[in-house]
C-alpha cells in the first residue's frame, strides 16, 4: 500500500515538474525569440557621414560626423570622427585676399576626402556656417561679406561632396544649436531611463543643461528658465524635440567674444591715456606690444569709443594686476540700464539662472590652459589663481610655457579675467552657483559647440516626436537576453538531472 502511494506521489511530482520545466523552457524560448526579433533588424550597418565647417572669427574648423543610417532618429547616435583646424585666421580676414580662400580650405577638405570612404563622398552633406566675425564684416559691408561667402562656396563646390551652402548663421541659431549639441550628447533628449550612465556630467534626471559658448567675437547663453513666460520675445525659442516641448532663453552678445572684448577694452582705456603709453593691468609685468590705432578702430565693436587721437600708434605696457584688470573689464558691461525685471548687461533681458551649465569653446580652452576646469575648484580659488597668474612676470611666463605662441600666451591673463567677469557680473553666477558650471571640451569624443546641432537640424535628425525605435534600451535588451538564456540553461540542467539520474533526484523524496 505504502509503495503504491509513494509511486503515485512520484508520478504526480515528476509530471508536475516536467510540466513546469516544459512550460518554463517554452516561455524562455518564446521570450528570447520575441526580444531578439523585435530588437534586431537584419540589416547590414550602413554608415552615413556629414561635414560642418565652423567659420569663426579667429579660425575655421572642419568637423566630420558619422552615424548608422538605420538609427538616424535615435538619440545620441551621431558622433564626431574628426576635427581639422584650418591653418590661418577666420574667413572674414580674407576680404583683401579672397583668391587665397581656395588654398586656405584645401588641407582640411583633403583630410575629409581621406577619412570618408570614397563610396560615400557624393552623399555626404557639407555645410559651412559663419559666425560673429562675418556678422561684423556684414555690418560694415554686405558686399564684402557676400564676396567672401561667394568665393568660399565656389571653393567648396569643387569637392566631390554634396555641398549644401555657406551662410552667416544668426546669434540665436548659434546659441540654440550649441544647446542642442550638448544636450544631445549628454542624452538629455532620450526619454528612456538609464540604469547606469557612461556620460560625464549626466545627472539621473532629464533636466537639460544650459549652454555657455565663448568665441572670439561673440558669446552666447542659452538655457531653459524656470518661468515659461518671457519678457523679451526676441530671446525666446520654442522647440519640440523627441516628443517634449522646450521653452528656451537665448542671447548672443556680439562684440563680447574674448578678442573683440579685448579690442573694446583697449579702445576704452586709450581714451584716457595721457600719451602713447598704455599701462595695462591685463597683461603680465614686463610685457610690451605696439598697437596701430587704425587696427583698433577697424571693428564696429570699438565704434562707441572712437576718437581722434594725437598719435597713430601706442604701446601696451603690462603691469599684471588682476583686480585692476577686473575693474577695467567691468566697464564694458553697462548695468545701469535695464528695461526688464532683470538684465544681463547692456539692457538685455536675462531670466534667473536655472540648473547646470556646460561652458565650452573658449570658456573651456582658456580655463583648461589655466588648469581651472576641475569641478572641485571653487570660484574663490579660481580668482586666487588668476591673481597669481596675472602678476607673474612676462619673462617667467614665456619660460614656463615655451611651447605656446606668444600672441595667445600674452592674452590668457585678460581672457581668464574676462571669463570670470562675464560669468559673475555679466550673467550673475555667484560663488554658490559656480559649481553648476561645467567646463566641457568634449562629450564622448565629440566637441561641444554649435556645429553638431546645426547638422542634426539640417539633416532632420532630431524628430519633433519620439520615434518608434527599438522598444528596449541596449542595457535592458542585454539583461533580458542573459536572464532568459540562464532560465533555459537551468531548465535544461534540471531536465537532464531528472532523466539521467532519477534515483539521485528522488532519493530524499518520501
Amino acid at each position: 500500500m505504502e509503495d503504491t502511494k509513494e509511486s503515485n506521489v512520484k508520478t504526480f511530482c515528476s509530471k508536475n515538474i516536467l510540466a513546469i520545466l516544459g512550460f518554463s523552457s517554452i516561455i524562455a524560448v518564446i521570450a528570447l525569440l520575441a526580444v531578439g526579433l523585435t530588437q534586431n533588424k537584419a540589416l547590414p550597418e550602413n554608415i552615413k557621414y556629414g561635414i560642418v565647417l565652423d567659420a569663426g572669427s579667429s579660425h575655421t574648423s572642419l568637423y566630420i560626423y558619422k552615424w548608422p543610417a538605420e538609427k538616424e532618429n535615435d538619440t545620441g547616435v551621431v558622433h564626431q570622427v574628426e576635427e581639422c583646424r584650418v591653418k590661418g585666421p577666420g574667413i572674414s580676414k580674407y576680404v583683401q585676399k579672397v583668391n587665397e580662400i581656395g588654398i586656405y580650405l584645401t588641407d582640411c577638405m583633403e583630410r575629409a576626402r581621406e577619412v570618408i570612404p570614397r563610396s560615400q563622398h557624393q552623399e555626404t552633406p557639407v555645410y559651412l556656417g559663419a559666425t560673429a566675425g562675418m556678422r561684423l564684416l556684414r555690418m560694415e559691408s554686405e558686399e564684402l561679406a557676400d564676396r567672401v561667402l561667394d568665393v568660399v562656396e565656389r571653393s567648396l563646390s569643387n569637392y566631390p561632396f554634396d555641398f549644401q551652402g555657406a551662410r552667416i548663421i544668426t546669434g540665436q541659431e548659434e546659441g540654440a544649436y550649441g544647446w542642442i549639441t550638448i544636450n544631445y550628447l549628454l542624452g538629455k533628449f532620450s526619454q528612456k531611463t538609464r540604469w547606469f550612465s557612461i556620460v560625464p556630467y549626466e545627472t539621473n534626471n532629464q533636466e537639460t543643461f544650459g549652454a555657455l559658448d565663448l568665441g572670439g567675437a561673440s558669446t552666447q547663453i542659452t538655457f531653459v528658465p524656470q518661468n515659461q513666460t518671457t519678457e523679451s520675445p526676441d530671446n525666446a525659442l520654442q522647440f519640440r524635440l523627441y516628443g517634449k516641448d522646450y521653452n528656451v532663453y537665448t542671447h548672443s552678445f556680439l562684440c563680447y567674444g574674448k578678442d573683440q572684448a579685448l579690442w573694446q577694452k583697449l579702445a576704452k582705456d586709450i581714451q584716457v591715456a595721457s600719451n602713447e603709453i598704455l599701462r595695462d593691468p591685463c597683461f603680465h609685468p614686463g610685457y610690451k606690444k605696439v598697437v596701430n590705432v587704425s587696427d583698433l578702430y577697424k571693428t564696429p565693436c570699438t565704434k562707441r569709443f572712437e576718437m581722434t587721437l594725437p598719435f597713430q600708434q601706442f604701446e601696451i605696457q603690462g603691469i599684471g594686476n588682476y583686480q585692476q584688470c577686473h575693474q577695467s573689464v567691468l566697464e564694458l558691461f553697462n548695468t545701469s540700464y535695464c528695461p526688464y525685471s532683470q538684465c544681463a548687461f547692456n539692457g538685455i533681458f536675462l531670466p534667473p539662472l536655472q540648473g547646470d551649465f556646460g561652458a565650452f569653446s573658449a570658456f573651456y580652452f582658456v580655463m583648461n590652459f589655466l588648469n581651472l576646469t576641475s569641478e572641485k575648484v571653487s570660484q574663490e580659488k579660481v580668482t586666487e589663481m588668476m591673481k597669481k597668474f596675472c602678476s607673474q612676470p612676462w619673462e617667467e611666463i614665456k619660460t614656463s610655457y615655451a611651447g605656446v605662441k606668444e600672441k595667445y600666451l600674452s592674452e590668457y591673463c585678460f581672457s581668464g579675467t574676462y571669463i570670470l567677469s562675464l560669468l559673475l557680473q555679466g550673467y550673475h553666477f555667484t560663488a554658490d552657483s559656480w559649481e553648476h558650471i561645467h567646463f566641457i571640451g568634449k562629450i564622448q569624443g565629440s566637441d561641444a559647440g554649435w556645429t553638431l546641432g546645426y547638422m542634426l537640424n539640417l539633416t532632420n535628425m532630431i524628430p519633433a516626436e519620439q520615434p518608434l525605435s527599438t522598444p528596449l534600451s541596449h542595457s535592458t535588451y542585454v539583461f533580458l537576453m542573459v536572464l532568459f538564456s540562464l532560465v533555459l540553461v537551468i531548465v535544461a540542467i534540471i531536465g537532464l538531472l531528472i532523466f539521467h539520474k532519477p534515483s539521485y533526484f528522488w532519493k530524499d523524496m518520501v
Epitope: 564676396r147 562684440c255 564696429p300 565704434k303
Partner: antibody, heavy 116, light 111 residues
Framework: QVQLVQSGAEVKKPGASVKVSCKAS????????MHWVRQAPGQRLEWMGY????????TFNQKFKGRVTITRDTSASTAYMELSSLRSEDTAVYYC?????????WGQGTLVTVSS | DIVMTQSPDSLAVSLGERATINCRAS??????????MYWYQQKPGQPPKLLIY???NQGSGVPDRFSGSGSGTDFTLTISSLQAEDVAVYYC?????????FGGGTKVEIK
C-alpha cells in the same frame, strides 16, 4: 519681413529741434547699422550719418556735425535722429535706411517742415 | 568728398526701348575688388528702392531688364526695355568712403 516704420510729419520753428524715430522689425536690430538720409524738395538725396545699434557708436557727415545726434533703444528696436538749430533749408523728407554699405530697406520717410 | 556726377539730367525713351544712365565718380569707388556703387529708383512720394548693388548685382525682386556695369570711376545703369512703371528718378550712390554721396538724379520719362 524687414520693415522700418518712421514717426509722423513735424512742423518746427527755426532754431528748434526735431527728433524722428525709426522702428525696425523683421530682423535682429543690432546686426545692421542704421543710416539717415534726407531729401529737400527737388534736391538730391543727402546722407547724414549712421549709428551702430550694437553699441551706440555713430559717424556723421561733417556738414551736420554738432547739429545731428543719432541714438537708439535696442529694447524697442528703434533708432532716433535729432536735428537741432533748425533752419528753413532743413525742410526735407528724412529717411532711415538699414545697411552696412547698401541701403536695401528704407523707412517711408518723415516730412519735417521748418517755418516761422 | 567723392562727387557723383550723373548724366543726363533727364531722359525720354519710347516704351520697349533701351534707356542708359551714366554716373561718374570724382575718384575710384573700388576697394578690395568690389565697386561700392549703387543705383536706386525713386517714384514720387516713395522712398528710394535699391536696384543695383556692387555696380552690377541686382537687388532682390528687381526685374531682369535692369542691369548695371562699370568699375573704378565710370558706371552705367541700363533699362533694356522701358516699361510704363519705370518712370521715375534714378540715383547713383557711392559708399566707399564717408560721407556717402549720391548723384543728382536722372529723370526717366516716356517719349
Amino acid at each position: 519681413q524687414v520693415q522700418l516704420v518712421q514717426s509722423g510729419a513735424e512742423v518746427k520753428k527755426p532754431g528748434a529741434s526735431v527728433k524722428v524715430s525709426c522702428k525696425a522689425s523683421g530682423y535682429t536690430f543690432t546686426d545692421y547699422n542704421m543710416h539717415w538720409v534726407r531729401q529737400a524738395p527737388g534736391q538730391r538725396l543727402e546722407w547724414m550719418g549712421y549709428i551702430v545699434p550694437l553699441n551706440g557708436g555713430s559717424t556723421f557727415n561733417q556738414k551736420f556735425k554738432g547739429r545731428v545726434t543719432i541714438t537708439r533703444d535696442t529694447s524697442a528696436s528703434t533708432a532716433y535722429m535729432e536735428l537741432s538749430s533748425l533752419r528753413s533749408e532743413d525742410t526735407a523728407v528724412y529717411y532711415c535706411a538699414r545697411g552696412g554699405t547698401r541701403f536695401a530697406y528704407w523707412g517711408q520717410g518723415t516730412l519735417v517742415t521748418v517755418s516761422s | 568728398d567723392i562727387v557723383m556726377t550723373q548724366s543726363p539730367d533727364s531722359l525720354a525713351v519710347s516704351l520697349g526701348e533701351r534707356a542708359t544712365i551714366n554716373c561718374r565718380a570724382s575718384e575710384s569707388v573700388d576697394n578690395f575688388g568690389v565697386s561700392f556703387m549703387y543705383w536706386y529708383q525713386q517714384k514720387p512720394g516713395q522712398p528710394p528702392k535699391l536696384l543695383i548693388y556692387g555696380a552690377s548685382n541686382q537687388g532682390s525682386g528687381v526685374p531682369d531688364r535692369f542691369s548695371g556695369s562699370g568699375s573704378g570711376t565710370d558706371f552705367t545703369l541700363t533699362i533694356s526695355s522701358l516699361q510704363a512703371e519705370d518712370v521715375a528718378v534714378y540715383y547713383c550712390q557711392q559708399t566707399k568712403e564717408v560721407p556717402y554721396t549720391f548723384g543728382g538724379g536722372t529723370k526717366v520719362e516716356i517719349k
